[in-house]
């Protein structure tokens, strides 16, 4: 790991994966186990992140890059670089200080994370509710009442299919 000396900075030629070692007259020494340097010219290697507990290793640490963590099943990442793991809830629930709670009436959550959000107010867009909302799903807004006035084309739901071998009563 010896290197040519730079007139500017004796450490500038140390590549990623090494550090400029004071104890060895500023030669480039390899990063020790469980540490890394992702850029050249470093005087230090950074300690590798350890994915412990609720974190699990997504990518091992190397001499040039840090470990990357994700979360064990039942949890999901929060924050830059998965700095925290938060408990999953079911669809139709949100995480509170007291654990997972069902969404209140008029709200929904279609994911295992995040908060319950209010159903869309169809009337604000001048539309009507085509399909009612649930704890897990938002309402589906349909055409506005004006669109259903005489002469206007509308989508009519198909008639229920008849069971074979039966005639209408």
């Amino acid at each position: 790991f010896e290197r040519t000396r730079s007139l500017q900075d004796p450490c500038s030629n140390c590549p990623a994966g090494t550090f400029c070692d004071n104890n060895r007259n500023q030669i480039c020494s390899p990063c020790p186990p469980n540490s890394f340097s992702s850029a050249g010219g470093q005087r230090t290697c950074d300690i590798c992140r350890q994915c412990k507990g609720v974190f699990r290793t997504r990518k091992e640490c190397s001499s040039t890059s840090n470990a990357e963590c994700d979360c064990t099943p039942g949890f999901h990442c929060l924050g830059a670089g998965c700095s925290m793991c938060e408990q999953d809830c079911k669809q139709g629930q949100e995480l509170t200080k007291k654990g997972c709670k069902d969404c209140c009436f008029g709200t929904f959550n279609d994911q295992k994370r995040g908060i319950c959000r209010p159903w869309t107010n169809c009337s604000l867009d001048g539309k009507s509710v085509l399909v009612n909302g649930t704890k897990e799903r938002d309402v589906v807004c349909g055409p506005s009442p004006a669109d259903l006035s005489p002469g206007a084309s509308s989508v009519t739901p198909p008639a229920p299919a008849r069971e074979p071998g039966h005639s209408p009563q």
């Epitope: 004071n22 104890n23 020790p32 005087r43 230090t44």
Partner: antibody, heavy 120, light 107 residues
């Protein structure tokens, strides 16, 4: 746990030499720098030099360059510091100390110290 | 050699006080500044390394900050067991050098 155990106190005559030992345990001796630091009575800390036992690479403070020799014996996990041509101002407590992560240059574990008294 | 200076050389404070010690390097040492505590008749102990990183087992009331040439060591709430002499040390350039120390006493 990491331990550095030093040899006992010494009384020496001016002009003589002293050799202080430092036996390491609780970690991989060859993977950490051993430093020697001294402290005269009522004074501050003075870095003398260090050694990397794995390849016996050494650094010395120029102030002691011609008088100090630092060695290491891997088979016994022991480091040594020998100071020659002793004078009264070398009366001090001599510490061996392990340097932790090799790129922060901080000494994380210290021996108990060895008092060297130089007196005629 | 890089010269390290500390101020004050001694100080007296009451239990619970916030205590601050400063350390100055004669040239830029980036963040290669370490702090040690030494009690009478004992070996020094590492408290803080690389300016602000707490050594394992060190109480969180100890902290450090700074960069370049000017550094600060703080005890947020002084405890009776903190009575000691505190030294800064630069790890930027050989030979490694220590400050002259700051003796901390209880009022």
């Amino acid at each position: 746990q990491v331990q550095l155990v030093q040899s006992g106190a010494e009384v020496k005559k001016p002009g003589s030499s002293v050799k202080v030992s430092c036996k390491a345990s609780g970690y991989t001796f060859t993977s950490y720098w051993i430093n020697w630091v001294r402290q005269a009575p009522g004074q501050g800390l003075e870095w003398m030099g260090n050694i990397y036992p794995s390849d016996t690479y050494t650094n010395y403070n120029q102030k002691f360059k011609d008088r100090v020799t630092i060695t290491a014996d891997k088979s016994t996990s022991t480091a040594y510091m020998e100071l020659s041509s002793l004078r009264s101002e070398d009366t001090a407590v001599y510490y061996c100390a392990r340097m932790g992560d090799p790129f922060y240059y901080a000494v994380d574990y210290w021996g108990q110290g060895t008092l060297v008294t130089v007196s005629s | 050699d890089i010269q390290m200076t500390q101020s004050p050389s001694s100080l007296s404070a009451s239990v619970g006080d916030r205590v601050t010690i400063t350390c100055r390097a004669s040239q830029d040492i980036s963040n290669y500044l370490n702090w040690y505590q030494q009690k009478p008749g004992k070996a020094p102990k590492l408290l803080i390394y690389y300016t602000s990183r707490l050594h394992s087992g060190v109480p969180s009331r100890f902290s450090g900050s700074g960069s370049g040439t000017d550094f600060t060591f703080t005890i947020s709430s002084l405890q009776p067991e903190d009575i000691a002499t505190y030294y800064c040390q630069q790890g930027h350039t050989l030979p490694y050098t220590f400050g002259p120390g700051t003796k901390l006493e209880i009022k």
